[in-house]
C-alpha cells in the first residue's frame, strides 16, 4: 500500500529482512526479532479446543513458495500470510482462519502482502 505523496518507484526489498517473531524465534533472536533472506510471516491456526493461535516469524527464501500458500491440513484450520516489503512488515499481517468446509480446509491462494 502506498501512502499519499509516496514515490511510485518500487523500493528494493532488503537483502536481509528483519521480522517480528512470536513462538517461532530462533535461538539467536533478540527482542523477538529474527533475520532472514526470505519472508516474514504471520500465521493463524486453530488449536484442539477451537481457539485461534496467532504466531509469527521468519521463513528462509528456499521453500517459501510453498510455505506462503495455504497448503491443506487434514481436519484442522491454518492460514499464513507472508511479506517482504520492509523490516517487521509482518506486524501488519492479519490472516484469518479459513471457513469451515464440509470436512477439511481446501486449497487456498498464495498470500503475499
Amino acid at each position: 500500500k502506498k501512502e499519499d505523496g509516496e514515490s511510485t518507484a518500487p523500493t528494493p526489498r532488503p537483502k536481509i529482512l528483519r521480522c517480528k517473531c512470536h513462538h517461532h524465534c530462533p535461538e539467536d533472536s533478540v527482542n523477538n526479532i529474527c533475520s532472514t533472506d526470505g519472508y516474514c510471516f504471520t500465521m493463524i491456526e486453530e488449536d484442539d479446543s477451537g481457539m485461534p493461535v496467532v504466531t509469527s516469524g521468519c521463513l528462509g527464501l528456499e521453500g517459501s513458495d510453498f510455505q506462503c500458500r495455504d497448503t491443506p491440513i487434514p481436519h484442522q484450520r491454518r492460514s499464513i500470510e507472508c511479506c517482504t516489503e520492509r523490516n517487521e512488515c509482518n506486524k501488519d499481517l492479519h490472516p484469518t482462519l479459513p471457513p469451515l468446509k464440509n470436512r477439511d480446509f481446501v486449497d487456498g491462494p498464495i498470500h503475499h502482502k
Partner: antibody
C-alpha cells in the same frame, strides 16, 4: 539448506535401550514437526510418531507407544528417539524426517526432509 | 488404521518410457496422499504432496493424480536416476501409513 544428521549405525544388546539422535540445521528447529520412521530390511516404511520441538507435544503410532519415546534438545537443535526393551524385531533403519510446513499447534503430514537413517542392530 | 496398497511390488521399464505407479487406500483420504523416492543407498526424497503438488527441486517429469481411494504417480521420459523404490503415504488420519513400495528397474 535443511540438513538432518543421524549416526550411521548402533549395535545394542537385547533387552537394552538405545537413544537415537537427529541433529537439525539450516532452518528454525522449533518451528516444524519432526517425524520418526522405521524400515525393516527389505520392507516398507512405518511411521513411529512425531514431536513438535517448541511445545514438546507428541503423537505416537499406537504400535510404538510402549517402545519409543520422543524428546528434543532445543539448545542443540537435536531430536531424540529412545527405544526400550530391544529385541531382534527392533533391528531396522530409523529415519528422522522434518515436516514441510511451519506449524505451531496443527498437525501436518508431509515428510519433506529426511535424515540418512541410523542402522540399528540388536544382537548379543 | 488406513491400509495403503501398492499392488505392483516391482516394475520394469526402459529409459524414455512413461511409467505409472498406483496406490490404493482402504478408505477415502481426501487427497492427502504423498509420494517418496528411496534410492538403493537408502536415501529418501519427498516428491509429491497433497496428490499432485511437486516439492521444490523435483523434476517436472514427475506428476501425481487421483482422488478418494485411488492415486497414481507418473514419471514421463524415464531417466536412469529415477531407478528407485517409490512409496505412497496417506496423511489424512493418524497414524500415518505407507504403501509397501514399488521397485522400479530398467529393462
Amino acid at each position: 539448506q535443511v540438513q538432518l544428521q543421524q549416526p550411521g549405525a548402533e549395535l545394542v544388546k537385547p533387552g537394552a535401550s538405545v537413544k537415537l539422535s537427529c541433529k537439525a540445521s539450516g532452518y528454525t528447529f522449533i518451528s516444524y514437526w519432526m517425524h520418526w520412521v522405521k524400515q525393516r530390511p527389505g520392507q516398507g516404511l512405518e511411521w513411529i510418531g512425531m514431536i513438535h520441538p517448541n511445545s514438546g507435544s507428541t503423537n505416537y503410532n499406537e504400535s510404538f507407544k510402549s517402545k519409543a519415546t520422543l524428546t528434543v534438545d532445543k539448545s542443540s537443535s537435536t531430536a531424540y528417539m529412545q527405544l526400550s526393551s530391544l529385541t531382534s524385531e527392533d533391528s531396522a533403519v530409523y529415519y528422522c524426517a522434518r515436516d514441510l510446513l511451519i506449524a505451531t499447534v496443527v498437525v501436518t503430514p508431509y515428510f519433506a526432509y529426511w535424515g540418512q537413517g541410523t542402522i540399528l542392530t540388536v544382537s548379543s | 488404521d488406513i491400509q495403503m496398497t501398492q499392488t505392483t511390488s516391482s516394475l520394469s521399464a526402459s529409459l524414455g518410457d512413461r511409467v505409472t505407479i498406483s496406490c490404493r487406500a482402504s478408505q477415502d483420504i481426501s487427497n492427502f496422499l504423498n509420494w517418496y523416492q528411496q534410492k538403493p543407498d537408502g536415501t529418501i526424497k519427498f516428491l509429491i504432496y497433497y496428490t499432485s503438488r511437486l516439492h521444490s527441486g523435483v523434476p517436472s517429469r514427475f506428476s501425481g493424480s487421483g482422488s478418494g481411494t485411488d492415486y497414481s504417480l507418473t514419471i514421463r521420459n524415464l531417466e536412469q536416476e529415477d531407478i528407485a523404490t517409490y512409496f505412497c503415504q496417506q496423511g489424512n488420519t493418524l497414524p500415518y501409513t505407507f504403501g509397501g513400495g514399488t521397485k522400479l528397474e530398467i529393462k
